[in-house]
């Protein structure tokens, strides 16, 4: 008799999840020699241990502590780039500006980027059929708790000037419910962080509005100021030109506004 399986509203675990996590760990340590002390098999065991045999709506940050410990990594605290709803451009930027880091440029962020995973209570099986959706099912699911945990730690580590890339094409340029708005903003440490600088990325070719005056940006400024952190904002009118100028800063066209 087939065992009854909980049907969740979200997509199931990404196919080849164990193989992908292990392969990504090996790749990361090849690319980043400073992380070669990491034992990738132990990393996978700790990752698996965080959610296997546990109810996928009952995951805690504590479940991920063994993984967090194994993945401890020091990134330059003044070279952190946060992002919200504009991941691809943020990653294109750090690919060119090699001394800056998004969360996905760290081992733990790299391991989990774009993946979904969950288990089932009291069985060692990974659920490839469905996983809980944050809104429709529960917020304490394995994926959401993971990102909340690593995002909090990443924000806590930041210092000096912290940059955040925001999507100017969205109705809420700053969204209080995003990971940036709900976790990272509140975990920047005022005793270490001097300024949060927002880069608002324009989508339209002819969009010359000052999106730094957007009400949601003003809301972000208010939250940040109340936390005794300075706030600044820049419009990036031409993201393509912006990237090109990061690659070739001496280009004559890079002195004008981008």
């Amino acid at each position: 008799v087939p065992r009854w399986r909980q049907q969740w509203s979200g997509p199931g675990t990404t196919k080849r999840f164990p193989e992908t996590v292990l392969a990504r760990c090996v790749k990361y340590t090849e690319i980043h020699p400073e992380m070669r002390h990491v034992d990738c098999q132990s990393v996978w065991d700790a990752f698996k241990g965080a959610f296997i045999s546990k109810h996928p709506c009952n995951i805690t940050e504590e479940d991920y502590q063994p993984l967090m410990k194994l993945g401890t990594q020091t990134v330059p605290c003044n070279k952190i780039l946060l992002w919200s709803r504009i991941k691809d451009l943020a990653h294109q930027f750090t690919q060119v500006q090699r001394d800056m880091f998004t969360l996905e440029d760290t081992l733990l962020g790299y391991l989990a980027d774009d993946l979904t995973w969950c288990g089932e209570f009291n069985t060692s099986k990974i659920n490839y059929q469905s996983c809980p959706d944050w809104r429709k099912d529960c917020s304490n699911n394995p994926v959401s708790v993971f990102w909340k945990t690593v995002s909090r730690r990443f924000a806590e580590a930041a210092c000096d000037v912290v940059h955040v890339m925001l999507n100017g094409s969205r109705s809420k340029i700053f969204d209080k419910n995003s990971t940036f708005g709900s976790v990272e903003v509140h975990n920047l440490q005022p005793e270490k962080v001097q300024t949060l600088e927002a880069w608002v990325i324009h989508g339209g070719r002819e969009d010359s509005r000052d999106l730094c005056q957007d009400p949601t940006i003003k809301e972000l400024e208010s939250i940040i100021s109340k936390r005794n952190i300075q706030f600044s904002c820049k419009n990036i009118y031409r993201p393509d030109k912006f990237l090109q100028c990061v690659k070739n800063p001496e280009d004559s066209s890079c002195t004008s506004e981008i």
């Epitope: 080849r16 193989e19 992908t20 392969a23 090996v26 790749k27 020699p33 070669r36």
Partner: antibody, heavy 120, light 107 residues
């Protein structure tokens, strides 16, 4: 078993570009970093750079920056290395290579090599 | 970039002889040195990884040692099929760099 099969020999004129392919089998392309190494006639081995095929991230040796483009097509499990503005000193055998799970960070897996001749 | 200075550049030895090749790194590379064998017209073949670990299927006459900056590769008893060029490579930092190679011939 893991296999890396490269495209055939190429003869190019100075100033032209060449694109060498490396089709993998026995594993998924995105599961490993792909490295490129070249060897001039009667010369030693020279590492050119790597690509992480999953994200398209690359790291190219200083000597080749601006002339080398590494790409990957995950739908066909093929990695590519394009070298532009060819000169006679680019005449070499070009290899793709990758690490394994029980080989530290050495390269147990190599393509058979692609000979590129640059001649006017 | 880390320079890998390999010596000798060539050597001639008799079958059964012990052959030793050295590689010196310009800075500390821990134990991240690999040794390759390359025969004419063929791709290099990994023999030793992480300074002293024999790769799967490699005969026990091949061995490696060293850490930091000084590394040694040894063929305990040279066989006719060992005629090849041998390279060291540091895999500690990018860019990876190779030694200049040692061509081994039979007397």
């Amino acid at each position: 078993q893991v296999q890396l099969v490269q495209s055939g020999a190429e003869v190019k004129k100075p100033g032209a570009s060449v694109k060498v392919s490396c089709k993998v089998s026995g594993y998924t392309l995105t599961d490993s970093v792909m490295n490129w190494v070249r060897q001039g006639p009667g010369k030693g081995l020279e590492w050119m750079g790597w690509i992480d095929p999953e994200y398209g991230r690359t790291d190219v040796a200083q000597k080749f920056q601006g002339r080398v483009t590494m790409t990957a097509d995950t739908s066909t499990d093929t990695a590519y290395m394009e070298l532009s503005s060819l000169r006679s000193e680019d005449t070499a055998v070009y290899y793709c290579a990758r690490t394994g799970y029980n080989s530290g960070y050495g390269f147990p897996y190599w393509g058979q090599g692609t000979t590129v001749t640059v001649s006017s | 970039d880390i320079q890998m200075t390999q010596s000798p550049s060539s050597l001639s030895a008799s079958v059964g002889d012990r052959v030793t090749i050295t590689c010196k790194a310009s800075q500390n590379v821990d134990s991240d040195v690999d040794w390759y064998q390359q025969k004419p017209g063929k791709a290099p073949k990994l023999l030793i990884y992480k300074a002293s670990n024999r790769y799967t299927g490699v005969p026990s006459r091949f061995s490696g040692s060293g850490s930091g900056t000084d590394f040694t590769f040894t063929i305990s008893s040279l066989q006719p099929e060992d005629i090849a060029t041998y390279y060291c490579m540091q895999s500690n930092t990018h860019p990876r760099t190779f030694g200049g190679g040692t061509k081994v011939e039979i007397k």
